[in-house]
Every structure is written in C-alpha cells, then in structure tokens.
C-alpha cells in the first residue's frame, strides 16, 4: 500500500493532533495520520498529528523504529486515536517494523 502513487484528488483523513506542533488544535486533516514517540533527556515525548502531503510522510512512515524514535502511521479517520508508538525492546523483534496500518 505504501508504494501506491498518490491519487489526483487524494482522500483526506481527520487525525488526532497532540503535541507542540498542534498549537491549540486537537485535530488536523491530512493524507496520513501518525503517532510518534521520541526521547528527550530520558523522558518519553508522544506526539500525534497528520501529514498533509503524501510525500511528507512517505519516508517517515517507512523508517524502522530506533532506540530513540518510533513513528506509526495509518490512513483512516481518527485512526491514530488509540495508537501509542513503541520503541523497540532490546533483544526482541519489534512487531511494527513496517509501522503502517490501514483502516
């Protein structure tokens, strides 16, 4: 699914938006939704939002999780509401390596 070329009139999805980039908004509209987790001086920082342009999220969503960053992407209205990105656990295979979910 990820390698599909974007359509001329791509479908837009409503996504939960949480984090600094959201300002006072609690939602956004885009071609993909995401849920991310990064580490800032030992603390987990969770963010949710949307990629308004397909190309914007294409590489990000394909990136496998690293010890300091994980992103999960999905397509579907509010599909990122109940997604909490997880960092890979040492010595365990990480189930969401592809990090892409269709709803």
């Amino acid at each position: 699914m990820e390698d599909e070329k974007p359509k001329v009139n791509p479908k837009l999805y409503m996504c939960v938006c949480e984090g600094l980039s959201c300002g006072n908004e609690d939602h956004c509209e885009g071609q993909q939704c995401f849920s991310s987790l990064s580490i800032n001086d030992g603390f987990h920082v969770y963010q949710k939002g949307c990629f308004q342009v397909y190309e914007q999220g294409k590489m990000t969503c394909k990136t496998p999780p690293s010890p300091g960053q994980a992103v999960e992407c999905c397509q579907g209205d509010w599909c990122n509401r109940n997604i909490t990105a997880q960092l890979p656990t040492k010595g365990k295979s990480f189930p969401g390596t592809q990090n892409f979910h269709l709803e």
Epitope: L37, I39, D41, G42, F43, H44, Y46, N82, T84
Partner: antibody, heavy 116, light 108 residues
Framework: EVQLLESGGGLVQPGGSLRLSCAAS????????MSWVRQAPGKGLEWVSA????????YYADSVKGRFTISRDNSKNTLYLQMNSLRAEDTAVYYC?????????WGQGTLVTVSS | EIVLTQSPGTLSLSPGERATLSCRAS???????LAWYQQKPGQAPRLLIY???SRATGIPDRFSGSGSGTDFTLTISRLEPEDFAVYYC?????????FGQGTKVEIK
C-alpha cells in the same frame, strides 16, 4: 535484567533528614528518567519526584517541594532522594522507579518512619 | 493538578467473572499518557497497561485497557485467583504526575 535496589530508610525524628539511594542495573541508566514514588501505610501510591536522564531537569510533588531534593550520579548508576524537614506524614515505603513516562520497573521499596 | 478518581473503591467478584474498573480524570488526558498498575500486599506495583490500551511485557491478554479524554477503563475478562489485588491508574500527561486512589478487587 533490570534491577532497582533502594536503601537508606529508617526511623527519624520530625524535622530530621534522611538520604535514600537507589542502585540501578540492567539498563543504560543515563538514558532514562527516574522517579521516587511513595506509599503511606495502608494508603495509595503518591508520585514524589522525577529527574531527567542527564539530571538537568527535576520535578516535585507540591507536598515535598522545598524539602526534598532528587539527584543522580550516572557514573555510579545511582538515584538519590535527600529528604529534609521530615514530617509524620512523610512516613511511607519509598520506591524508586524507572520512569521515562509510565513506571515500568520498580524497586522493592525502603521504609521511612518519621516519629518522635 | 490532574485528579484521577477511580471507581468503585472495592469490587467484590468471584473467579471467572469479568471486572470493569473505571478511572476518571478531572481534565482531558491524552491516551498515550495513561497507565494502569496492579499491586498485591507486600509487593511493589507492577505495570499492566500503558498508552491506555497497550499491554506491558508479560501481561496476560485477559487484561485490557480502553478510553480517551477523561474516561478510562481497565477490564479483566475472566478473573483468575492471582488477579485479586489493588489496581491504580496513573497519568503522566501533566506535572505533577498523579495516581488514582485505587480500586481493590476482592474475592466475593
């Protein structure tokens, strides 16, 4: 295997001081924030304080602000809680916890009793 | 601060029954920042659920979490004898981090 081992608890008089330690092993200590959580006898859990991985940021519950100081020595993989001006209501089991956000690993706890 | 109110205070059930525990926040909490713990007498708490619905490592699938905003739920689909304990919710969305007062699940 992640292990957290608290020490330093004991009986202290009101107004006294105590320093708790937590020796950590089994993970890259400096990469994770750490917390102290306490539990008074027969009561629920109360978050006390947290410190970032580098030690540069610290956070406290209002009930201990100005009296307790959290710190860490990443070269020794050890977390500390300096408790001053202790009160009877500080009597509790004190747990250290690995806590980048939620508390995924806990120590066994050390009992602090503040009584005259 | 965000106050978490758990209900009921005590839940009296028999093994095999379903347990539904509630955690209500005084203000909206992102689901990514809500966790549940189990504590048995004389033991340290154990992480069960994080991100409102993700099970921690080694937690049986009879434990599930759900909810968003101000209302969160922990469900134990079929109580096993070892599940009788006290359960706490916790938010790490805003400082100070806070716990609910706990729900005791006891044998009926």
């Amino acid at each position: 295997e992640v292990q957290l081992l608290e020490s330093g608890g004991g009986l202290v008089q009101p107004g006294g001081s105590l320093r708790l330690s937590c020796a950590a092993s089994g993970f890259t200590f400096s990469s994770y924030a750490m917390s102290w959580v306490r539990q008074a006898p027969g009561k629920g859990l109360e978050w006390v304080s947290a410190i970032s991985g580098s030690g540069g940021s610290t956070y406290y519950a209002d009930s201990v602000k100005g009296r307790f100081t959290i710190s860490r020595d990443n070269s020794k993989n050890t977390l500390y809680l300096q408790m001053n001006s202790l009160r009877a209501e500080d009597t509790a089991v004190y747990y250290c916890a690995k806590s980048a956000s939620f508390f995924d690993y806990w120590g066994q706890g050390t009992l602090v009793t503040v009584s005259s | 601060e965000i106050v978490l109110t758990q209900s009921p205070g005590t839940l009296s059930l028999s093994p095999g029954e379903r347990a539904t525990l509630s955690c209500r926040a005084s203000q909206s909490v992102s689901s990514s920042y809500l966790a549940w713990y189990q504590q048995k007498p004389g033991q340290a708490p154990r992480l069960l659920i994080y991100g409102a619905s993700s099970r921690a490592t080694g937690i049986p699938d009879r434990f599930s979490g759900s909810g968003s905003g101000t209302d969160f739920t922990l469900t134990i689909s079929r109580l096993e004898p070892e599940d009788f304990a006290v359960y706490y919710c916790q938010q790490h969305f805003r400082w100070p981090w806070t716990f609910g007062q706990g729900t005791k699940v006891e044998i009926k």
